[in-house]
């Protein structure tokens, strides 16, 4: 019954010190989202929850923002912060939908970034 | 107070259409879905389906597609069931629940309507 | 769709004992398991959530366990106000619930 598809930035690449918009979707799913978490490996950077808002994990709250729309912006970026990126998003009845975003941070002033998508 | 209050009870005749209202107070109406459950004279639970609070798109369980229509009104945090061609099946109560809980895990009923029952007689 | 079978249907007990009511799936919930109350006249009562997390404000006498499909919900000493029907309700999928169980007075 889970007919809903999520779709991200995919893979991206950023420039260390500078910041990248970590963005995903959910469409093709009549279920409603009540929380989408954001989470890096097993640990929680923040959560959107549908009634209380943003909450940023304290250890994050310098170099994450909220935003845009259900995404996530990472600043100051360093070459720790390469790795991969989840969005999970709660809906009802459907359950849990996971999108992946693997972020490589290069040391390199150029960075090739990945095609930028837009939430229309 | 987090409440839901429903419309009082209704005689009808068969063929007949009845539009039940389920008001929501003291909470975020489109942050949490709306279901609609009916309870027959002496029977169990029956759940009938959702509405998207957010999106205002209805969901029909199995048995409850073409007579039965879900509908809101966000301005007023207002919940609607009508049901049309009413037959003497229909009488039961019917109540509409909230789904609370943030995350998947959480999800439950947590709030209720007082019921509203409909009777259909001739 | 998920069936959901409630053992037993009708439960006779006295004040203080221990009562216990089973619900088993027909297939994997994992923990995606609710209980309610129901008094008669009444709109039900949510008492437990996620199989085993008691809702604030019920009493601690009614607790909830199991995963998968089986799991039951336990009333170590039955009170007066106890004597309902109860209700176990899956979130898995489309939600659906079990026939009920009345409990009655001895």
């Known amino acids: 019954m889970m007919t809903g598809t999520i779709e991200t930035t995919g893979n991206i690449s950023a420039e260390k010190g500078g910041s990248i918009i970590l963005q995903c979707h959910l469409s093709s799913t009549t279920a409603q989202v009540t929380q989408v978490n954001w989470e890096q490996q097993d640990q929680l950077l923040a959560i959107c929850n549908a009634d209380l808002g943003w909450h940023i994990s304290p250890s994050f709250k310098d170099r994450v923002a909220p935003g845009p729309g259900l995404g996530l912006t990472l600043q100051s970026l360093t070459v720790n912060d390469t790795g991969e990126y989840f969005c999970i998003y709660h809906t009802y009845p459907d359950g849990t939908y996971t999108g992946r975003i693997f972020l490589e941070v290069l040391e390199s002033s150029v960075a090739e970034h990945g095609a930028r998508f837009q939430i229309p | 107070e987090v409440q839901l209050v429903q419309s009082g009870s209704e005689l009808k005749k068969p063929g007949a259409s009845v539009k039940v209202s389920c008001k929501a107070s003291?909470?975020?109406?489109?942050?949490?879905?709306m279901n609609w459950v009916r309870q027959a004279p002496g029977q169990g639970l029956e759940w009938m389906g959702w509405?998207?609070?957010?999106?205002?798109?209805?969901t029909y369980a199995q048995g409850f597609t073409g007579r039965f229509v879900f509908s809101l009104d966000t301005s007023v945090s207002t919940a609607y069931l009508q049901i049309s061609s009413l037959k003497a099946e229909d009488t039961a109560v019917y109540y509409c629940?909230?789904?609370?809980?943030?995350?998947?895990?959480?999800?439950?009923?947590?709030?209720w309507g007082q019921g509203t029952m409909v009777t259909v007689s001739s | 769709d998920i069936q959901l079978t409630q053992s037993p249907s009708f439960l006779s007990a006295s004040v203080g004992d221990r009562v216990t009511i089973t619900c088993r799936a027909s297939q994997g919930i994992s923990s995606y398991l609710a209980w309610y109350q129901q008094k008669p006249g009444k709109a039900p009562k949510l008492l437990i959530y996620?199989?085993?997390t008691l809702q604030s404000g019920v009493p601690s006498r009614f607790s909830g366990s199991g995963s998968g499909t089986e799991f039951t919900l336990t009333i170590s000493s039955l009170q007066p106000e106890d004597f309902a029907t109860y209700y176990c309700q899956q979130l898995n999928s489309y939600p659906t619930f079990g026939g009920g169980t009345k409990v009655e007075i001895k």
């Open positions: 629940a909230r789904v609370g809980g943030y995350s998947v895990y959480d999800y439950a009923f947590d709030i």
């Open positions: 003291g909470y975020t109406f489109t942050a949490y879905p």
């Open positions: 509405i998207n609070t957010n999106t205002g798109n209805p």
């Open positions: 996620a199989a085993s």
